[in-house]
Amino acid sequence: TGADTEAVVCVGTACYTAHSGKLSAAEAQNHCNQNGGNLATVKSKEEAQHVQRVLAQLLRREAALTARMSKFWIGLQREKGKCLDPSLPLKGFSWVGGGEDTPYSNWHKELRNSCISKRCVSLLLDLSQPLLPSRLPKWSEGPCGSPGSPGSNIEGFVCKFSFKGMCRPLALGGPGQVTYTTPFQTTSSSLEAVPFASAANVACGEGDKDETQSHYFLCKEKAPDVFDWGSSGPLCVSPKYGCNFNNGGCHQDCFEGGDGSFLCGCRPGFRLLDDLVTCASRNPCSSSPCRGGATCVLGPHGKNYTCRCPQGYQLDSSQLDCVDVDECQDSPCAQECVNTPGGFRCECWVGYEPGGPGEGACQDVDECALGRSPCAQGCTNTDGSFHCSCEEGYVLAGEDGTQCQDVDECVGPGGPLCDSLCFNTQGSFHCGCLPGWVLAPNGVSCTMGPVSLGPPSGPPDEEDKGEKEGSTVPRAATASPTRGPEGTPKATPTTSRPSLSSDAPITSAPLKMLAPSGSPGVWREPSIHHATAASGPQEPAGGDSSVATQNNDGTDGQK
């Protein structure tokens, strides 16, 4: 069925209409839209009370609604693909006519968690209970329905129409009937405010056709924000009743003449307006003409007024409303300026902090200052930033370049720096030699020594350690430890065996690789290599070979 029975309540600058009819939310919105409105908003407790009043009016006219729990669509919807958001008062829903999210809500129960389906909100009315201002209709969300299938218990909908202003209802000074026709095609004979552009038809008399006079008026904007009918004096006056009928149609006082005629008057502090019926305060500020936080200030002799704005705001072109002053236009800050309602604030770029001479000044943050350095080793402060550096033998590492990582010179890009064995240490390295060889005074080369079946010669003393210089010596083998049966480290080299610059054979005794003294308490394996090969030495015999084949991917075994 379509929408039929309707009720109307006009208040402030809006009218609300309630309609019965089992329509989907889209059909209901379309119905409101055709007359220039939208499904109603309920953005505050006050608005909820207006909507409740129009629903109460509708329910008084409706004979019998089919469900005890009836639902009426309002203009709160969540589009397909938009998820429920529990952190917001409107839970991710928004008003169909647009407008900002508002803090007021009145949800019936916890909302169904969904994203895929479009969801719509209706007001839930328990028809077994009287509608009380203290018990406002709850919001119920659900599917939006479809033509012919509006959804369970949907009995109607509420529309809202907004206007630039309202006229007071016409005052009748004698018997008669007023019929208002609104721009949204509703006719009513009792409105507490009548929207701009409404027509009023006044039929005077007591129903006796011979005595009936008709008047036609339009609610017009007489001056900015001033709306009236353009009528003068009370309508349908009758000497028979004088002031006794509806106070003669007067807003405040009614004065009768001896001949049955009468005039309207006003109480002290008020004046009679051009319609000769309505009274307005002599104080022009009493009608609160100023908006947006502006204060009304009376002019001399109380005749006119001006609006005054709080600090940080200025009057707009209407001279009635306050708008924020954008203080950032004057560039009051050294770096970033953020305009705020009624003011502004200065902010500093990353790497700077508030401080220095002058308002809104910024000064460099010394990231390298004691206790706040983000660098593992060296830190250099720069204007607005910083950079990290590492001691010799370390390189910058980490995603943000603040960490230092030991350079393993034994497997470095320039190749190993030692002629034979290489022991990496934190920030440095040491060279060593195979059995039967001794470390030369340069700490890098190996020279033939007395034949020995002992372990390889350990690292040189500190003063003999290899200098950290680039080298073009090609890399040979890197040994990688494994655990022996007794849990002792056992060298298992993972690259090609070394070539030695002498014909002397490598002894067949297994090599025991020793962690050099002064190295950290972790096993570091040597790298076995040599720059040139004069002749190929014999393959070592026996159990633990100190040499293994190269990885098939061409890489060295990891430490």
Epitope: K80, R112, N113, S114, C115
Partner: antibody, heavy 120, light 108 residues
Framework: QVQLVQSGAEMVKPGASVKISCKAS????????MHWVRQTPVYGLEWIGG????????AYNQNFKGRVTMTRDTSISTAYMELSRLTSDDTAVYYC?????????????WGQGTLVTVSS | EIVLTQSPATLSLSPGERATLSCRAS???????LHWYQQKSGASPRLLIY???NLAFGIPARFSGSGSGTDYTLTISSLEAEDVAVYYC?????????FGGGTKVEIK
Amino acid sequence: QVQLVQSGAEMVKPGASVKISCKASGYTFTDYEMHWVRQTPVYGLEWIGGIDPETGDTAYNQNFKGRVTMTRDTSISTAYMELSRLTSDDTAVYYCTNYGNLYYYAMDYWGQGTLVTVSS
Amino acid sequence: EIVLTQSPATLSLSPGERATLSCRASSSVSSSYLHWYQQKSGASPRLLIYSTSNLAFGIPARFSGSGSGTDYTLTISSLEAEDVAVYYCQQYSGYPLTFGGGTKVEIK
């Protein structure tokens, strides 16, 4: 507790269709949306689409539009995902999943997965 | 559609080390709609962190998440053997939902 139990592995020929089921238990079936995600070695995890069991409304990934159909049978708390015109690229593990009482599409519950192999 | 790029592809760390996984979006994502999943070998994905920084039920406190806009991070403060898995980020800011390519975390 919430459980999502999927139908068994499928071997299908190129050009054919496959229909996988996902039976829900431990909650009111119409309360939570049901989504389908697949996993392949090449493309990783891909969202196929989802269905709102209360209304039957669906949302599909455009990449599967025209080939995928999601349905549900509320009487047996089961969701279905049918994919047609299969190619070898559709060989994957298919999961049904939903976000239970969590918000913002954080998929809290997952089925055990259904391996679909497309091979001639 | 929003593309999520995860790095590194593989992360090899020793037990007790801190793991930092990155997820970068091709355009801004609401922090409410960015989630992390853990998938162990042969298992279904498991929700780890939802809405950028909230631990899912039963997830140990060594996992944490942070980020906003286009850059998000999953951190494992002290890696344990049981954390060996592939970790995925996922976002929603309109259909389709998308997942990152994953970061494989392994023990050195």
